[in-house]
């Protein structure tokens, strides 16, 4: 039994780091393998992660962490019974994939303005709480070409757009994702999408 693709890990910079790797053949990850991880710090204990299968030869493990600081470094040991298959390390702050925003809501009752709001996925004591920027994706269910991205580069988790920038009388969907420039993160997953019917009063044309 050998590791074909070494573990690569990403952290949500709060409580979970996810490591994925591939073995050289079909493997029952949860029965045959264990990933041991330990924070390199004074009182830290070694923890064991039981991997799950991720395709025939792929394995994935969710490492639980109480908290995280920028300087954190973890040792990782991948075991098959008594055999050490791979040894490595992981710095969460260098491989951050933020949590997805939640509670995306479209408020349509504000005088021909659409107000989209969502929740910051981090609590205020987390560094990323004040460092996320967002991308909002709006698209038409009727017209695949009617697809747009709005970049929200301010901290407030909201976006206002004129309803008239979208077509009236049709349904739209929106979703939002996050990233943080400070740690050069990847984008988060998209939030669940929300749907609304766009209608607004056309301005009265005078001839």
């Amino acid at each position: 039994m050998k590791v074909l693709q070494e573990p690569t890990c990403v952290s949500d910079y709060m409580s979970i780091s996810t490591c994925e790797w591939k073995m050289n053949g079909p493997t029952n990850c949860s029965t045959e393998l264990r990933l041991l991880y330990q924070l390199v710090f004074l009182l830290s204990e070694a923890h064991t992660c039981i991997p799950e299968n991720n395709g025939g030869a792929g394995c994935v493990c969710h490492l639980l962490m109480d908290d995280v600081v920028s300087a954190d470094n973890y040792t990782l040991d991948l075991w098959a019974g008594q055999q050490l298959l791979w040894k490595g390390s992981f710095k969460p702050s260098e491989h951050v994939k933020p949590r997805a925003p939640g509670n995306l809501t479209v408020h349509t009752n504000v005088s021909d303005t659409l107000l989209l709001t969502w929740s910051n996925p981090y609590p205020p004591d987390n560094y990323l709480y004040n460092h996320l920027t967002y991308a909002v994706n709006i698209w038409s269910e009727n017209d695949p070409a009617d697809f747009r991205i709005y970049n929200v580069t301010y901290l407030e988790p909201s976006l206002r757009i004129a309803a008239s920038t979208l077509k009236s009388g049709i349904s739209y969907r929106a979703r939002v994702r996050a990233w943080a420039q400070c740690y050069n993160t990847t984008w988060s997953e998209w939030s669940p999408s929300t749907k609304w019917h766009n209608s607004y009063r056309e301005p009265f044309e005078q001839h």
Partner: antibody
Framework: QVQLQQSGAELVKPGASVKLSCTAS????????MHWVKQRPEQGLEWVGR????????IYASKFQGKATITADTSSNTAYMQLSSLTSEDTAVYHC?????????WGQGTTLTVSS | DIVMTQTPLSLSVTPGQPASISCRSS???????????LEWYLQKPGQSPQLLIY???NRFSGVPDRFSGSGSGTDFTLKISRVEAEDVGVYYC?????????FGQGTKLEIK
């Protein structure tokens, strides 16, 4: 051996400012959050705020916002707390504590007396 | 802010007898990562506080097994199965789940 060594007792006049220090040995403050806790005479413990020494990110209890400023110098392995516009209400023992992710290591406390 | 309320505020116990301190939070102290950061600290006379229990039930290294923690949600308890003379001091519960972090008002334990 792990230790948090705090600066000595201070006697300062009302309206002045003071900067308390806390130097760690036996570990690197970059690996923890450094917190400050206030304890007034014959009273309980009050959380003031904390810093992530690597990026300088601070959070404070709302009542200490504007009163306390926590900083850290990773090169000297030291955390600081400056208290401004001092009044008699600020007379207390101030503890620095490292949290990872609980308060395992406490400094011996610095006694601050505000009196004219 | 979450208020941590301890009862009783003082207790006097005969050596060898059990003692129990209750701590109630004004709202849930489950962190958004799913953990409950409820801790117990003992401040012996003239000393800084010391950690006894973390994450509700876990004894810190070197803490005698006569100390135990329990509870969930908003109700938590510290039990000392057989009080010894060295256990005197003020016991504080603490929540580190939600900012601002908060301590209970303290329970003073003395020996009869």
């Amino acid at each position: 051996q792990v230790q948090l060594q705090q600066s000595g007792a201070e006697l300062v006049k009302p309206g002045a400012s003071v900067k308390l220090s806390c130097t760690a040995s036996g570990f690197n403050i970059k690996d923890t959050y450094m917190h400050w806790v206030k304890q007034r005479p014959e009273q309980g413990l009050e959380w003031v705020g904390r810093i992530d020494p690597t990026n300088g990110y601070t959070i404070y209890a709302s009542k200490f916002q504007g009163k306390a400023t926590i900083t850290a110098d990773t090169s000297s392995n030291t955390a600081y707390m400056q208290l401004s516009s001092l009044t008699s209400e600020d007379t207390a023992v101030y503890h620095c504590v490292s949290r990872r992710p609980w308060f395992a290591y406490w400094g011996q406390g610095t006694t601050l007396t505000v009196s004219s | 802010d979450i208020v941590m309320t301890q009862t009783p505020l003082s207790l006097s116990v005969t050596p060898g007898q059990p003692a129990s301190i209750s701590c109630r939070s004004s709202q849930s102290i489950v962190h958004s990562n799913g953990n409950t950061y409820l801790e117990w600290y003992l401040q012996k006379p003239g000393q800084s506080p010391q950690l006894l229990i973390y994450k509700v039930t876990n004894r810190f290294s070197g803490v005698p097994d006569r100390f135990s923690g329990s509870g969930s949600g908003t109700d938590f308890t510290l039990k000392i199965s057989r009080v010894e003379a060295e256990d005197v001091g003020v016991y504080y519960c603490f929540q580190g789940s939600h900012v601002p972090y908060t301590f209970g008002q303290g329970t003073k334990l003395e020996i009869k």
